[in-house]
């Protein structure tokens, strides 16, 4: 019975951007100004989000979709739907409760947000440091130290490792 009733429900015919108006014999009425319905069959329209103060309008509200906000320059969005604004820092810094602080030696941040991360440890991959790291940039790893020995070409790829027990041909 419930299933039959839902199939015959006149409200299910109301498209997005409208609501099923109980006060008008369940006629589909357009959403009033500053409201929207993003799906069909709605009995009410939702109030549009207002991007006020430091929240700027990135996308205007329409009858079928909510407004989208972003943050005034100097801050960036955080949280679902930009529910918060968090301050930017410069590259080479990270945000702490004391404000923006320079990355410690051995760490870097190449963005205006996020935390300082340790430089890549080239030696873990058997490589050498080609370009030193800074607060803003990671190190650049180059060929392994063995590849840089006299007579070796730095552009020649390393020879594939031989399996144990196999002698050179």
């Amino acid at each position: 019975f419930e299933r039959t009733r839902s199939l015959q429900d006149p409200c299910s015919n109301c498209p997005a951007g409208t609501f099923c108006d109980n006060n008008r014999n369940q006629i589909c009425s357009p959403c009033p100004p500053n409201s929207f319905s993003s799906a069909g069959g709605q009995r009410t329209c939702d109030i549009c989000r207002q991007c006020k103060g430091v929240f700027r309008t990135r996308k205007e509200c329409s009858s079928t979709s909510n407004a989208e906000c972003d943050c005034t320059p100097g801050f960036h969005c955080l949280g679902a739907g930009c529910s918060m604004c968090e301050q930017d820092c410069k590259q080479g810094q990270e945000l702490t409760k004391k404000g923006c602080k320079d990355c410690c030696f051995g760490t870097f941040n190449d963005q205006k947000r996020g935390i300082c991360r340790p430089w890549t440890n080239c030696s873990l991959d058997g490589k050498s440091v080609l370009v030193n790291g800074t607060k803003e940039r990671d190190v650049v790893c180059g060929p392994s130290p063995a590849d840089l020995s006299p007579g070796a070409s730095s552009v020649t790829p390393p020879a594939p490792a031989r399996e144990p027990g196999h002698s050179p041909q």
């Epitope: 430091v54 529910s83 918060m84 604004c85 968090e86 702490t96 409760k97």
Partner: nanobody, 123 residues
């Protein structure tokens, strides 16, 4: 309704003082870090100072250290910014902003903002 309302802005001469206030309502004020953030004409937002829930920690941007003092009165649901030795470069709209639920743990997002109060430092 969660709300922050700033007051106390105005025109002041260089070297003068002002005290900004922020009245909070609609939430448990004593459970949140609070911030002052400013926006100079034609510039982006700049964080100025923050204060822990119980007032035990306070931090400032370098440019205002020794001149500005942030404080709070949890019994009155109020945040303050005492501004001394004001300079022309302090001219800005000053916003009171609430730290989000994860402020100081996972991030430093601010989720509730006032409408701002204007401070103009000019002779």
């Amino acid at each position: 309704e969660v709300q922050l309302v700033e007051s106390g802005g105005g025109l002041v001469q260089p070297g003068g003082s002002l005290r900004l206030s922020c009245a909070a309502s609609g939430f448990t004020f004593s459970s949140y870090w609070m911030n002052w953030v400013r926006q100079a004409p034609g510039k982006g937002l700049e964080w100025v100072a923050n204060i822990k829930e119980d007032g035990s920690e306070k931090y400032y941007v370098d440019s205002v250290k020794g001149r500005f003092t942030i404080s709070r009165d949890n019994a009155k649901n109020s945040l303050y910014l005492q501004m001394n030795s004001l300079r022309a470069e302090d001219t800005a709209v000053y916003y009171c902003a609430r730290g989000g639920d994860s402020y100081g743990y996972r991030d430093y997002g601010m989720d509730v903002w006032g409408q701002g109060t204007t401070v103009t430092v000019s002779s």
